[in-house]
Amino acid sequence: LEDCAQEQMRLRAQVRLLETRVKQQQVKIKQLLQENEVQFLDKGDENTVIDLGSKRQYADCSEIFNDGYKLSGFYKIKPLQSPAEFSVYCDMSDGGGWTVIQRRSDGSENFNRGWKDYENGFGNFVQKHGEYWLGNKNLHFLTTQEDYTLKIDLADFEKNSRYAQYKNFKVGDEKNFYELNIGEYSGTAGDSLAGNFHPEVQWWASHQRMKFSTWDRDHDNYEGNCAEEDQSGWWFNRCHSANLNGVYYSGPYTAKTDNGIVWYTWHGWWYSLKSVVMKIRPNDFIPNVI
């Protein structure tokens, strides 16, 4: 009986070892299949829509990255509260797993749009450098399913790049007008979102806890209408120290108001940036190294 029990234990240990080996092989096979599939799907630089089929839905780009898909491009995601899936660009560089929520690159899209467009999202969801706004509804679904870090990549017309990063980026729902909440800042571009660059201007320049405004839905703290004057939808205060949805100009500009693509703490109010990428990833993101 004792021999039988020992033999049972030995066989169990062997089974466990075999299970581990099979699992490792499965992971390797999956990785190779995915690499093969993605290479097949990567039809050049411009159109980067990647169809993974309906095998599995993903809640954000970090899940896609950690499932072995390492190619940047447009994928379909469905956050927890979201009633439907939607397309988003996943940036699998810079550590990987970034869900791109906004992009400005060339002024090809009109960002002077109304509440419904900003709520649902608009723009080019096909091309790698296509400009878009993911949609406030989708931002809400994304940022209430996990703690996210917002990273903003900025570039000017003189080939300089800076970034700003905020922990715990949150967007409220339609009932509280997609209110913005951000946490601790880090980066090289300066803290234009929370307006911490100067205590005296914070009361009117900070975007923290501001509701979203568009030309047809004014929720700012200004007697006039910031969105109308600045020709974009944004979390305006009275009015802004950052407006990444502003009018696309080529660098320094003159206009009735500071309505360009502005990040005050880097280039001030009268310089419109060349490119912007706003992207999010879970605070505690750990790449799955297979």
Partner: antibody, heavy 116, light 107 residues
Framework: EVQLQQSGPELVKPGASVKISCKAS????????INWVKQKPGQGLEWIGW????????DHNEKFKDKATLTVDTSSSTAYMQLSSLTSEDTAVYFC?????????WGQGTLVTVSA | DIQMTQSPSSLSASLGERVSLTCRAS??????LSWLQQKPDGTIKRLIY???TLDSGVPKRFSGSRSGSDYSLTISSLESEDFADYYC?????????FGGGTKLEIK
């Protein structure tokens, strides 16, 4: 540490109403949805609905639309569920939960007994 | 509503044994499935999310897998604290729905 602390057991008469609570701690209450779930004695689980504390927005399982009212008090980080026109069918343990992508936290449950 | 059919409804097993529970979804849920454990004292804990990802702090003897519309929870070697009730939960669409549960008992 995230915690959801639910109120104690309730014994209520048929036809009456009861309001049970779920006090959140260890995180910013207004950031995340709170869901409610029902479990009848010795039976399985049923989803009742959710509330988003940031705005008070709610959504219900059709089955509980006229039964459960979900509210929050952000000043005390507490979610409430009021059950009305109680019958023996409402005798159950009610759970609140915070369900995120990478974590889920459940309250310990509140037993509501409907008896004459 | 999506129906989740869980089997078996009860299961007797010995310590060290390997067991599997299954849930079948009546519609496509694309991997939006969790496995929950309810202890005899009523406390509930999520073990697995997205069909196969282990929640933080959950022992590695638990694993989740999927084959089409069938989702499985496997415990590779049962320990005394694993004897409890287990439920699957689909969160692909509202209303969220649960499997009927599996009572896992000591043989």
């Amino acid at each position: 540490e995230v915690q959801l602390q639910q109120s104690g057991p309730e014994l209520v008469k048929p036809g009456a109403s009861v309001k049970i609570s779920c006090k959140a701690s260890g995180y910013t209450f207004t950031d995340y949805y709170i869901n409610w779930v029902k479990q009848k004695p010795g039976q399985g689980l049923e989803w009742i609905g959710w509330i988003y504390p940031g705005s008070g927005n709610t959504d219900h399982n059709e089955k509980f639309k006229d039964k459960a009212t979900l509210t929050v008090d952000t000043s005390s980080s507490t979610a409430y569920m009021q059950l009305s026109s109680l019958t023996s069918e409402d005798t159950a343990v009610y759970f609140c939960l915070r369900f995120l992508l990478r974590s889920a936290y459940w309250g310990q449950g509140t037993l509501v007994t409907v008896s004459a | 509503d999506i129906q989740m059919t869980q089997s078996p409804s009860s299961l007797s097993a010995s310590l060290g044994e390997r067991v599997s529970l299954t849930c079948r979804a009546s519609q496509e849920i694309s991997g939006y499935l969790s496995w929950l454990q309810q202890k005899p004292d009523g406390t509930i804990k999520r073990l697995i999310y997205a069909a196969s990802t282990l929640d933080s702090g959950v022992p590695k003897r638990f694993s989740g897998s999927r084959s089409g519309s069938d989702y499985s929870l496997t415990i590779s070697s049962l320990e005394s604290e694993d004897f409890a009730d287990y439920y699957c939960l689909q969160y692909a669409s509202y209303p969220w729905t649960f499997g009927g549960g599996t009572k896992l008992e000591i043989k």
